[in-house]
Amino acid sequence: MMTGTIETTGNISAKKGGSVILQCHLSSTMAQVTQVNWEQHDHSLLAIRNAELGWHIYPAFKDRVAPGPGLGLTLQSLTMNDTGEYFCTYHTYPDGTYRGRIFLEVLESSVAEHSARFQIP
């Protein structure tokens, strides 16, 4: 029985040209995380973190994706085209597969600074 839940950073925004950390966290299960797949909105794989085999960053993203922190992923040199959904797929043993969703909005620098100011309580 799958008892775990995926917590994600949810909807996030970042500046064009900047970087952002995509992070998911699996909780409420004792299952072992054996692999995490990071996918873009069009189902193309950005990176895989296998518990035993390590990281693989796909060639199309090698220049702009850095592994980590942890099982997360750092997207760099953001462009407007990076706006969209990102999915973390946690393959676990023995539970099976958990999936989380993050929506990233890449904003023009001035807009991002402006919206960030309004988010400060």
Epitope: Q35, N37, L53, T97
Partner: antibody
Framework: QVQLQESGPGLVKPSETLSLTCTVS??????????LAWIRQPPGKGLEWIGS???????YYNPSLESRVTISVDTSKNQFSLKLSSVTAADTAVYYC?????????????????WGQGTMVTVSS | EIVMTQSPATLSVSPGERATLSCRAS??????LAWYQQKPGQAPRLLIY???TRATGIPARFSGSGSGTEFTLTISSLQSEDFAVYYC?????????FGGGTKVEIK
């Protein structure tokens, strides 16, 4: 190029333990970044994954066989082995050892890249 | 566990014709799908990984497509050496599971 060779008895009596060994040549298990797997194929039927082990000793088993299966690795001999207890006629099959994930670092996929030629094991009294 | 279902069980095709084999997963496996070819008395060999990428040394007449739950292996022009059984397999997650196979036979 890594090659695999299965060895073990071709005939096992019901209720006994089936024991097979896979010898890896052309590469060292202790430094290899891949899974070592056992897969079987009953006569005239399809493929069934039995289980996999990593060099560190992490094991993963098919839930339908888990209570009867033990996979272990001996890095000093460059071998890994399969033990299947309490066998019945339903365990009669060709048993393959395989390497999974050998190309993960380069290509990002985990699949059974390299296979042994297989060994037929018959369970009969 | 993820159940892999292949269809048809047997496909009768004439040499030189196109063969289309299907594989369906009981839940999404993204593009984590491999195809294997097995000839009588031989071990399977990896044809396609990542749903669509040919393994080393595999001829261009073999192509894979699909994502999620629906996958296809196409052999564009069947050669005599292509008559065999073909299996799909998902990985990850554990347990690894294979489809039941499609036998491609000479019509």
């Amino acid at each position: 190029q890594v090659q695999l060779q299965e060895s073990g008895p071709g005939l096992v009596k019901p209720s006994e333990t089936l024991s097979l060994t896979c010898t890896v040549s052309g590469g060292s298990i202790s430094s290899g970044s891949y899974y070592l797997a056992w897969i079987r194929q009953p006569p005239g039927k399809g493929l069934e994954w039995i289980g996999s082990i990593f060099r560190s000793g992490s094991t993963y088993y098919n839930p339908s066989l888990e209570s009867r299966v033990t996979i272990s690795v001996d890095t000093s001999k460059n071998q890994f082995s399969l033990k299947l207890s309490s066998v019945t006629a339903a365990d009669t099959a060709v048993y393959y050892c395989a390497i999974e994930g050998a190309n993960f670092k380069d290509f990002g996929y985990v699949a059974f890249d390299i296979w042994g030629q297989g060994t037929m094991v018959t369970v009969s009294s | 566990e993820i159940v892999m279902t292949q269809s048809p069980a047997t496909l009768s095709v004439s040499p030189g014709e196109r063969a289309t084999l299907s594989c369906r997963a009981s839940q999404s496996v993204s593009s984590n799908l491999a195809w294997y070819q097995q000839k009588p008395g031989q071990a399977p060999r990896l044809l396609i990984y990542g749903a669509s990428t040919r393994a080393t040394g595999i001829p261009a007449r073999f192509s894979g497509s699909g994502s999620g739950t629906e996958f296809t292996l196409t052999i564009s022009s069947l050669q005599s050496e292509d008559f065999a059984v073909y299996y799909c397999q998902q990985s990850p997650p554990w347990p690894r599971t294979f489809g039941g196979g499609t036998k491609v036979e000479i019509k």
